[in-house]
């Protein structure tokens, strides 16, 4: 049976085997087409989600679709039901928490009272000014908290207590990529991890350990990527994996936070990378133990210079490394998180590509997660 499962796929009605390599090849080889059912699916970027959260204390902003203007949500008459609606609009199914935070002197956006219409937040038309002088600070999910804070050093062995959102994404029990837990159902990773194998069956996720071989595997229900853009072949290197069964969170299995829409990280901002990838360029061997390293944001202009990536780094990507080189992600780290710590840990980047590993003028290039929040929310909403 193990041999059969490894090399063949069973079609139903009539029952017969086809070679596994015919799965997800774009051809209907089973009469009912089930060989093309459980495949990596593409999902378009979709419409703008009309709610978002700002890095200013996770305050809620709502889009007025008539004018295209964003407004800050006033705390006046804000309720648990409105909080749930806001989070559902972003695709969250968990119970949110919210509180009032004082409007600061530098409040830029206008402030309006919020109501609900057809399960979407709207500005209340007939409202007065914001009497409470407070905004809504909203958290859709408890995320980004770990049991242990990493020390700031070069490269060192990591503990799952520091990075409880880190997962190993495996095909046929072999580690292929890293990934990050975003909520009980969803793991974030890179689209290029699935280029070779587009059938969902043999992909598994392992969570809750810093050792590669030692933890149980979780079945995957769906793998979703963005439609490929031939104009920018390296863009859109992002994927979401939906787990068959929701994770139970613990000290070693927890979600990381998505970044805020306005999370603009300036050059030299300290960040962290983790993974089981190669420890040497062309080193030929994965690390058995999770490794961590501190890096920093590298200016996109510098990253696109003639002696570096020569304009290949788009606005939907970001560079990180250390100016003198030597600390970088490498093969096998792909899909893992580039992380920023404010009050919580946020996944600001996804390990994507680069020339070599650790070169001084060619740092790691990462998918900029904030550029894809809309896509993530739309995928989640479609799967609620």
């Amino acid at each position: 049976k193990v041999i059969l499962d490894k090399y063949y796929f069973l079609c139903g009605q009539p029952l017969h085997f086809i070679p596994r390599k015919q799965l997800c090849d774009g051809e209907l080889d089973c009469p009912l087409g089930e060989d093309e059912e459980h495949c990596v699916k593409s999902f378009p970027e979709g419409p703008a989600v009309a709610v978002r959260l700002s890095k200013d204390r996770s305050t809620l902003q709502v889009l007025d679709s008539a004018t295209g203007n964003w407004f800050s949500a006033c705390f006046d008459n804000f309720t648990e039901a409105l909080a749930e609606t806001a989070c559902r609009q972003m695709g969250y199914s968990s119970k949110p928490t919210f509180r009032a935070v004082e409007i600061g002197p530098d409040q830029d956006l206008d402030v309006v009272e919020i109501t609900e219409n057809s399960q979407e937040l709207r500005m209340r038309n007939s409202s007065g000014p914001c009497l409470s002088g407070s905004l809504v600070s909203l958290h859709c999910l408890a995320c980004g908290k770990s049991l242990k804070t990493p020390r700031v050093v070069g490269v060192e062995e990591a503990s799952v207590d520091s990075w409880p959102w880190q997962v190993s994404i495996q095909y046929d029990k072999q580690h292929v990529c890293g990934g990050s837990i975003l909520d009980p159902h969803w793991v974030l990773t890179a689209a290029h991890c699935f280029r070779k194998h587009t059938d969902v069956f043999n992909w598994k996720v392992r969570a809750g350990s810093d050792k590669l071989g030692s933890f149980p595997s979780l079945a995957v229900a769906k793998i979703i990527i963005i439609e490929f853009n031939p104009m920018y072949p390296k863009d859109n290197d992002i994927a979401l994996m939906k787990l068959q069964f929701p994770l139970t969170f613990s000290g070693t299995v927890r979600p990381i936070c998505l970044p805020f829409f306005d999370e603009e990280l300036t050059p030299a901002t300290p960040l962290w990378i983790i993974g089981w990838g190669f420890t040497k360029q062309n080193g030929g061997k994965m690390s058995d133990i999770l490794l961590q390293a501190s890096v920093q944001v590298i200016d996109s202009t510098r990253c696109n210079a003639d002696d570096a990536y020569q304009g290949e780094v788009t606005e939907k990507m970001m560079c990180a490394g250390i100016p003198e080189g030597g600390v970088d992600t490498c093969q096998g780290d792909s899909g893992g998180p580039l992380m920023y710590q404010s009050d919580q840990w946020h996944v600001v980047g996804i390990v994507s590509w680069g020339y070599g590993c650790g070169g001084p003028s060619t740092p790691g290039v990462y998918t900029k997660v904030s550029a894809y929040l809309n896509w993530i929310y739309n995928v989640w909403k479609a799967e609620l």
């Epitope: 006033c74 002197p105 530098d106 206008d110 309006v112 007065g128």
Partner: antibody
Amino acid sequence: QVQLVQSGAEVKKPGASVKVSCKASGYTFTRYYMHWVRQAPGQGLEWMGWINPNSGVTNFAQKFQGRVTMTRDTSTSTVYMELSSLRSEDTAVYYCARVRIGWLQSPPLYWGQGTLVTVSS
Amino acid sequence: DIQMTQSPSSLSASVGDRVTITCRASQSINTWLAWYQQKPGKAPKLLIYAASSLQSGVPSRFSGSGSGTDFTLTISSLQPEDFATYYCQQAISFPLTFGGGTKVEIK
């Protein structure tokens, strides 16, 4: 675009009252506090008070308590400022000014053209 | 009430000069400070809010800084249209209070 249009210049005798109007357009009238600020000839700016056009609630500087009334008419999107027991030192240009965004401590951004009130016997 | 003291009360400068106006509050106002420009016979115009945030549409040669009790308005390169009177205003508590004004005149 936001516009605040004030009533014309007035000449009043000491002891009389004056009522200045400020008609708003180009935005949702009830959503933004309106301040009144005055400026005596050759002098600086002096805050008088505010009105919430949605509820009609007002707040005045201590100096004007008992002499000033601020009202609004939501049907015409107009706010009014009435100052009674006028004295010569009330001679000034009176401005209505809408806050920048919809909460109280936001600075006045949109200003009316000003109404000159002259108090003279 | 919070007193706002501006200095100087007037200054003479030439086109292209860098001009600095200061404003001091009688107690800490965090960054609850706005700056206005007023030309003769006209209403004041908001330039800066929150001590350093440039109001939309205001030229970038205007900048504000400071926090607590001491604040500065800087015009990096004075233009002919900048000759006017400038006022600071605190917004941390009522009554709102304005500085006495600084008149910027042509040298």
